[in-house]
Structures are given as structure tokens and as C-alpha cells.
Interface confidence: medium
């Protein structure tokens, strides 16, 4: 039963972590930049995402307009969707091999193939993972290296905008979830169902680490 | 005294290769990022681009990229502003000017000009 | 690119005449704006950052003004020494321009 509710927790964090990636894609807040004057802070706030930018005005109006070209894109923007939707998509494959695999569903009959299953979704999760974290920390450090450029004009100098802390969190979800689908399942491949039975009886759920943590900073 | 020497005048004919310094004293050379602009006869100035001395990163203008090469030696204090293949049009005096490592981008000491003349 | 559209391109006043020297940038540049001196012959000099601070050592008689796309440099009382062209810069946006320059004259 322990490893069943480690079954559920795990594939609730990637859930959690699915939707998290698919917020933390679709929302033009991976880089912002506050437009600072002398001494007050200019009524405009610009959003950069991977699909669109936006400017906020004082009055909280909003104006965006979706990125023209695709080719005249820089190539680590174009890189970044498109390992932002290849882990979303990974991830969704995830969700179905463990769905194939899990206890409560009939695709799968046998115990062990089943246990197979929802270690390959574990994987797969932790991959999709990883996808999440590559765009997210190359953004993130791109960020950070031009905040810290004294060659780089400030309107060139952004902040780490709400869309990168969330495919941090995407990350973390998705790889603490795969982590525990992985720890649930049999070390062996091919023991037989008393092996697989008496594993999971037995099993501790395992310490997981989340992703390393970012040190926080007040940009302006 | 903070000072910023630079090379003597130059002739050189098209198609030539040209290196030109910038021999800085008087300051902590890594407080600084050197930056080269340029002004043709009679015009304005025009900036174009600089290096941190502290990780050789440079910073071009788009219209200089890939026609000049900004390099720094921290161990002499010298800026250079490098050339492969010279052309008439960039006949011009060049000055090398620095910016405060921790300030905002403008030029607060200018170097005294180095003339290139590119005839044939 | 900003462009810094300078005026005039150059003007002629007597001693104690005052001088107003206006740049425009074609964007808002939020104060990002340095002015140079730059006399015959010689280096350019700065004079003016952040729009309207006065550098150490340069004389109260110059000063700036201005917010957003429009500044004006000031020279309120001219001396026979403040002969040059006169330079803006803007510094918020990449690459770093100048405008065209206004040459000064004593009448």
C-alpha cells in the first residue's frame, strides 16, 4: 500500500509539474524589464516570453504582440520553445506509459511488465524534467550575465521574470514525481511477481532532493 | 594623472592590415571597460564598441562587427582596436575613451586620437 | 538603433550671450544623456551625465536639461574659451549614439 500512495504522489507532482511547465511556456514573463527613470520608476513594465511580448502600462493596460518570424528569432529563443514543448510533450508520453502500467488499470496484466511501466514513466518524467530545467537555467543565466555586464546598455538589461521561477518549479515537481515513480518499482528486471510483491512491501519511500537552490536577489 | 596614450598616425593602402593602441595610466585598468570611437573627417562621433579587461567580453556596434577586432593586453594596460583588411572609408580619427566598470555608459576620459589615413 | 537628432548644427553668439543647444532622441531615453565639448583640434571632453549632473571641474555656467525624448544643454552666460563643437550622447540603449554635433562661435 506504501508504494501505491507513493504511485499517487508521484504522478500528482508531475501533474502539478506538467501544468506548471505549460503555465511557465505559454506566459511572455520569462524576462522582464522595469524602465527605471532618474529617480521614479517610468509607468512601463515590459514581459518577454517565448511566444510574445508585452507591455503594462501604469493604468494596467496591456498590449502584446506575437513574435513576427520565426527564422529572425535569436536561436536560443527558438531553442528554448522548442525544448519547452518537446518536455511538455515527453512528459505527456509519461503520463501515458504510467497510466498503461499503473496498479488500478487493466492494460497490462502482469505484475512485473506493469512495474516496468511505471519505472519507464519514472524516467521519462525525470527527463522531461531535465527538459524543463535546460531552457529555464540558460535563460535564467543569459539573465543574469547581461544584469552583471557593465558593456550591456541598460535598456538591454532585463530581469528574471514569474515564467522561469515557475519552470523551476515544473522542473522540481516533475523530477521529485519521476524520482518516486522510479523508487516504487523492483531494482531487478526480471524476478517474478512473489519478488516484485514482497519488494513493495517492503520499500521505504526514498529521500528526493529537489533542484539545487538559486540564490535569490533584488535586480533593481 | 589618469592618462590614455595612443599610437602615432597611420597611412596605410587598402586592403592592409592595422593595429593601433591604447596605453592606459593612472588608474586600476579592470575598474574600466575601454571602448573605441571613431570620427571621420568633419562628422560626428561614432561609437564602436568596447571590452571588459576583466574577461576579454566585447560589445559591438552592429555597424563595426566583423570588421574590427577589440582585444586588451591587462598585463601592459593597452587596449588595441585591429584591423585585416583596411578600406578608403575607414579613414578616420579613431579615440579610446573608458567607461567606469560600475557606472552608466558614458565616456568620462578620452584618449587623444590616433589619425588613420587609408589612401591608395 | 536611437537616433539623436542635435540642434542647431552650429550658431554664433557674443560674450555673455546665452546658448541653449536641444537634442532629440527618437525614443524616450529616460535621462540616459551625457553632453561633450570637444574644441578645435582636441579630444572631447565630458561635461553633463545622467541629463543634467555636472561633472567635477566644469563650470556652473553650463548645465542641462530635459525627460524622455527631449534635452537641452545650456551654456547661460558664453566665454570666449567655451568655443567647440558640442556633443550628446544617449547611453540607455545599444549601440551608444551620438548626435551631429553643434559647432559654437563667438560673433
Known amino acids: 500500500m506504501a508504494s501505491a500512495g507513493m504511485q499517487i504522489l508521484g504522478v500528482v507532482l508531475t501533474l502539478l509539474g506538467w501544468v506548471n511547465g505549460l503555465v511557465s511556456c505559454a506566459l511572455p514573463m520569462w524576462k522582464v524589464t522595469a524602465f527605471i527613470g532618474n529617480s521614479i520608476v517610468v509607468a512601463q513594465v515590459v514581459w518577454e516570453g517565448l511566444w510574445m511580448s508585452c507591455v503594462v502600462q501604469s493604468t494596467g493596460q496591456m498590449q502584446c504582440k506575437v513574435y513576427d518570424s520565426l527564422l529572425a528569432l535569436p536561436q536560443d529563443l527558438q531553442a528554448a520553445r522548442a525544448l519547452c514543448v518537446i518536455a511538455l510533450l515527453v512528459a505527456l508520453f509519461g503520463l501515458l506509459v504510467y497510466l498503461a502500467g499503473a496498479k488500478c488499470t487493466t492494460c497490462v496484466e502482469e505484475k512485473d511488465s506493469k512495474a516496468r511501466l511505471v519505472l519507464t514513466s519514472g524516467i521519462v518524467f525525470v527527463i522531461s524534467g531535465v527538459l524543463t530545467l535546460i531552457p529555464v537555467c540558460w535563460t535564467a543565466h543569459a539573465i543574469i550575465r547581461d544584469f552583471y555586464n557593465p558593456l550591456v546598455a541598460e535598456a538591454q538589461k532585463r530581469e528574471l521574470g514569474a515564467s522561469l521561477y515557475l519552470g523551476w518549479a515544473a522542473s522540481g515537481l516533475l523530477l521529485l514525481g519521476g524520482g518516486l515513480l522510479c523508487c516504487t518499482c523492483p531494482s531487478g528486471g526480471s524476478q517474478g511477481p512473489s519478488h516484485y510483491m514482497a519488494r513493495y512491501s517492503t520499500s521505504a519511500p526514498a529521500i528526493s532532493r529537489g533542484p539545487s537552490e538559486y540564490p535569490t536577489k533584488n535586480y533593481v | 594623472e589618469v592618462q590614455l596614450v595612443q599610437s602615432g598616425a597611420e597611412v596605410k593602402k587598402p586592403g592592409e592590415s592595422l593595429r593601433i593602441s591604447c596605453k592606459t595610466s593612472?588608474?586600476?585598468?579592470?575598474?574600466?571597460?575601454m571602448h573605441w570611437v571613431r570620427q571621420m573627417p568633419g562628422k560626428s562621433l561614432e561609437w564602436m564598441g568596447g571590452i571588459d579587461p576583466n574577461n576579454f567580453n566585447t560589445h559591438y556596434n552592429q555597424k563595426f562587427q566583423g570588421h574590427v577586432t577589440i582585444s586588451v593586453d591587462k598585463s601592459i594596460s593597452t587596449a588595441y582596436l585591429q584591423w585585416s583588411s583596411l578600406k578608403a572609408s575607414d579613414t578616420a580619427m579613431y579615440y579610446c575613451?573608458?567607461?567606469?566598470?560600475?557606472?552608466?555608459?558614458?565616456?568620462?576620459?578620452w584618449g587623444a586620437g590616433t589619425l588613420v589615413t587609408v589612401s591608395s | 538603433d536611437i537616433q539623436m537628432t542635435q540642434s542647431p548644427s552650429s550658431l554664433s553668439a557674443s560674450v555673455g550671450d546665452r546658448v541653449t543647444i536641444t537634442c532629440q532622441a527618437s525614443?524616450?531615453?529616460?535621462?540616459?544623456l551625457a553632453w561633450y565639448q570637444q574644441k578645435p583640434g582636441k579630444v572631447p571632453k565630458l561635461l553633463i551625465s545622467?541629463?543634467?549632473s555636472l561633472e567635477t571641474g566644469v563650470p556652473s555656467r553650463f548645465s542641462g536639461s530635459g525627460s524622455g525624448k527631449d534635452y537641452t544643454f545650456t551654456i547661460s552666460s558664453l566665454q570666449p574659451e567655451d568655443i567647440a563643437t558640442y556633443y550628446c550622447q544617449q547611453y540607455w540603449s545599444a549601440p551608444l549614439t551620438f548626435g551631429g554635433g553643434t559647432k559654437v562661435e563667438i560673433k
Open positions: 593612472g588608474y586600476t585598468f579592470t575598474e574600466y571597460t
Open positions: 525614443e524616450d531615453i529616460y535621462n540616459r
Open positions: 575613451a573608458r567607461i567606469y566598470y560600475f557606472g552608466r555608459l558614458y565616456f568620462d576620459f
Open positions: 545622467g541629463a543634467t
